[in-house]
């Protein structure tokens, strides 16, 4: 049902000139590679007789750290790359003075997206090349010239999967209250077919539209305490990898078959969504597998049916809703959609009508919560690895990151007078804000104990008078005797201790004879071994949950489910007097020491596990030959 190309136009719109509010002058210079697009930005738009102030924040959860893009190179080979350090221009936020408002916009070339005020959904897009201050059209979805689109998921296919549908299931909650559970994350992989690529004309245009779509989908799902994170984008710029049929059910089947074949070499994701430029038969614009999220059939197909990306975003949100176990609203007796205007439909309405929906009904929320009770939904609990998200450091998250001197949490929580919570810079006159060697905003004097000795394999640490952090935790020299064993990197590993760690308090090391052979895959005893440094053999205690065991006589070894690998005796475990397991063999203690390290410490320190001098209080590394006070005096006292 897609309108004929080029894109259909708006029937009725208002011309506005957005005005960007000056941002706060933050007292820190961040590196230029953080990009051109600010962390936060505000715009004033005069539309429908009102001045709307939009407060926006960059959606830093839009792309997962391992985000990849796959396309076909000029020579015909398939290329997958991980774009690094790219800035982006996709924002989310709210409208000032409207409690239940929402906004999702891109600012890449002018403003494009939507903002919702009460029951009105306003779409905005640039009319010319004038950038963010140029002429923009603001209009309502019903004024976009388009035909109603429907979802291809039939009532028959839903019935058996969703169970009985009665109003009793649904206990309405206030429209704006979030489910009081942990946030769930959908790690999304998007495939763009060749028809869509041809329609948009370039990889850059496809990337921009997909990020815009996913930004909108994410905003719609935030009301359900969900985040949608794009982990991969595949653009079929040369040819389709499977037949994209005008029959959406055939295309979905082909997508899922293709995905099953690709899973091993493509991103591990929770959900795959195809965006196609093919016009599906009839009025259908989307089709999905119901309750398939986290399974091999977790996916849907979406026709890009509207000029505005909000259109396909609503379709994707709807089809993803089916993947999450939701039924069409009209199939559920007593289902309440909180939309207040006449034609108001929620996201899971079977047909999107002439206006884009912006919220989920009470029954969609109830279906979702019931889906989340299934064990299969576990894939949604893991947050994507957010270690390299686009967008740089966050002031207010308790992590001192690039460009920050301190971080005491969000301004509303910060109680640290040494740190300015809005700039993450030290307060006037403060030397430090955090650390065990920081007191009253000043660095503690050298020699003050900052980390006491925990056990016989540990060493105590002292402030050095220069840094607010306690020096790195160091341990007794490897090979130092400890209870029943020898210290190794701060631990005192013994067979008994390892068996207790796996099998609980009743676990003990098995008889010595159990260690006298190796085990081959399939629990077969094999060749004789002369020491106790092979497979960890225990007896007694409780079998560890989720682990298979290999029993040979009275010897219990832990194995993987397929029986191909065994829990080894760890490095450093005592295997005899003055002997330790090292590289899988029982060896002499001197494997730990290359020389008499402690002799280099001038009687003012001892050797640590790294074969470095660990100085007594007040003495300076590396050889404990000078007092810290002398060293500081010579180099100028403080940081």
């Amino acid at each position: 049902i897609a309108p004929s190309r080029p894109w259909a136009l708006m029937e009725q719109y208002e011309v506005v000139l957005p005005w960007r509010l000056p941002g706060p002058r933050v007292r820190r210079a961040l590196p230029s590679h953080l990009g051109l697009h600010p962390e936060r930005v505000s715009y004033v738009l005069g539309a429908t007789g009102h001045n709307f102030t939009l407060h926006l924040r960059k959606n830093r959860d839009l792309l997962g750290s391992g985000y990849t893009e796959t396309y076909t190179a000029a020579n015909g080979s398939e290329v997958t790359e991980q774009p690094r350090g790219q800035d982006h221009c996709f924002y989310q936020g709210h409208v000032e003075g409207y409690p239940d408002s929402a906004a999702s916009l891109s600012t890449c070339a002018g403003l494009r997206g939507f903002f919702q005020v009460g029951s009105d959904l306003h779409l905005i897009e640039p009319l010319d090349e004038g950038g963010e201050g140029g002429r923009h059209a603001v209009y309502q979805a019903e004024h976009l010239l388009q035909t109603a689109g429907t979802c291809g998921v039939s009532d028959d296919s839903l019935g058996s999967l969703l169970g009985p549908r009665t109003a009793a299931v649904f206990r309405p909650r206030p429209g704006d209250s979030l489910p009081s559970r942990e946030t769930r994350y959908v790690e999304l992989y998007v495939v763009v077919d060749n028809a869509e690529f041809q329609m948009l004309g370039s990889e850059a245009a496809v990337r921009h539209r997909v990020l815009e779509v996913v930004n909108h989908v994410d905003k719609l799902y935030q009301k359900l305490n969900f985040r949608v994170v794009l982990v991969g984008l595949e653009i079929w710029n040369s040819q389709d990898r499977f037949h994209v049929s005008p029959d959406p059910s055939v295309t979905l089947e082909n997508l899922l078959t293709w995905q099953a074949r690709q899973r091993t070499r493509r991103h591990l994701h929770d959900n795959v969504q195809l965006i196609t430029g093919v016009d599906f038969t009839g009025t259908t614009v989307g089709f999905a597998r119901v309750s398939a999220m986290c399974s091999h059939s977790s996916g849907a197909v979406n026709q890009d049916h509207s000029k505005n990306p909000v259109g396909v975003a609503c379709t994707m949100a709807h089809e993803m809703g089916h993947n999450l176990g939701m039924d069409h609203d009209e199939n559920v007796q007593g289902c309440r959609c909180q939309e207040r205007f006449e034609a108001g439909r929620c996201i899971m309405a079977g047909s999107i009508g002439s206006s884009f929906p912006r919220m989920f009904s009470d029954c969609s929320q109830a279906y979702l919560e019931s889906f989340l009770e299934r064990p299969q939904s576990v894939c949604l609990a893991n947050a994507p690895d957010l270690s390299h998200l686009v967008g740089g450091p966050v002031c207010g998250n308790l992590f001192v990151e690039r460009g920050e001197q301190c971080d005491c949490g969000p301004p509303e929580d910060c109680r640290n007078r040494c740190c300015n919570s809005t700039t993450c810079q030290l307060a006037e006159g403060a030397q430090c804000a955090h650390g065990t060697c920081c007191q009253e905003c000043k660095v503690k004097p050298a020699g003050e104990l900052c980390r006491p000795k925990k056990d016989m394999c540990d060493l105590e640490e002292f402030c050095d008078g220069r840094h607010p952090e306690c020096p790195e935790d160091a341990f007794q020299e490897n090979g130092t005797p400890c209870s029943g064993g020898y210290c190794y990197n701060g631990a005192c590993p013994t067979l008994a201790q390892q068996c207790q760690a796996f099998w609980g308090p009743g676990g003990q090391a098995a008889e010595e004879s159990c260690f006298s052979y190796d085990i081959l895959p399939g629990c077969k005893a094999s060749r004789y071994r002369a020491d106790m440094c092979g497979v960890l053999q225990c007896k007694g205690g409780q079998q560890p949950l989720g682990r298979a065991i290999c029993i040979v006589d009275v010897c219990h070894a832990l194995t993987t489910e397929d029986g191909t690998a065994y829990e080894p005796v760890p490095e450093g475990t005592r295997c005899g007097p003055e002997k330790v397991c090292w590289k899988g063999r029982c060896q002499d203690l001197h494997v730990y020491r290359s020389s008499n390290c402690s002799a280099q410490c001038h009687n003012h320190g001892v050797c640590n596990h790294k074969q470095e001098c660990h100085c007594h209080a007040g003495w300076a590394p590396p050889h404990c030959a000078k007092l810290l006070t002398e060293v500081h005096a010579a180099s100028g006292s403080l940081p």
Epitope: E182, R184, N225, A383, S387, V394, N397, G409, P410, D413
Partner: nanobody, 124 residues
Framework: EVQLVESGGESVQVGGSVRLSCAAS????????MGWFRRAPGKERELLAA??????HYADSATGRFTISRDNAKNMVYLQMNSLKTEDTAVYYC???????????????????WGQGTQVTVSS
């Protein structure tokens, strides 16, 4: 699979000390703000302390008596509790929240992983 496993809960006398440990697995530990919460009988679950790197935050009820720390090398977070009172009797939970999430540290919905809890009983 992500797991947070608390340990160290025990029964102690008023004025005693307890050190709770939380072992994290299956997540990029250094990317998470770790928090300790507790639920006392008949009360709501409340935040006690949170830690990033190297910063910490304490709720009023924990300031002065409790110390939160972490060991990124071992994927561990600890809560040292001193001068315990009978009102400290509760189930103590460890939780993790992405360092990239925003908003108050007290918003429990932002913590995406939770442990099963460990019981601490303080008697007179």
């Amino acid at each position: 699979e992500v797991q947070l496993v608390e340990s160290g809960g025990e029964s102690v006398q008023v004025g005693g000390s307890v050190r709770l440990s939380c072992a994290a697995s299956g997540l990029t530990f250094s990317n998470f703000i770790m928090g300790w919460f507790r639920r006392a009988p008949g009360k709501e679950r409340e935040l006690l302390a949170a830690i990033g790197d190297p910063s910490t935050h304490y709720a009023d009820s924990a300031t002065g008596r409790f110390t939160i720390s972490r060991d990124n090398a071992k994927n561990m977070v600890y809560l040292q509790m001193n001068s315990l009172k009978t009102e400290d009797t509760a189930v103590y939970y460890c939780a993790a929240r992405s360092r990239y999430s925003t908003g108050t540290l007290y918003d429990q919905t932002k913590y995406i992983y939770w442990g099963q809890g460990t019981q601490v009983t303080v008697s007179s």
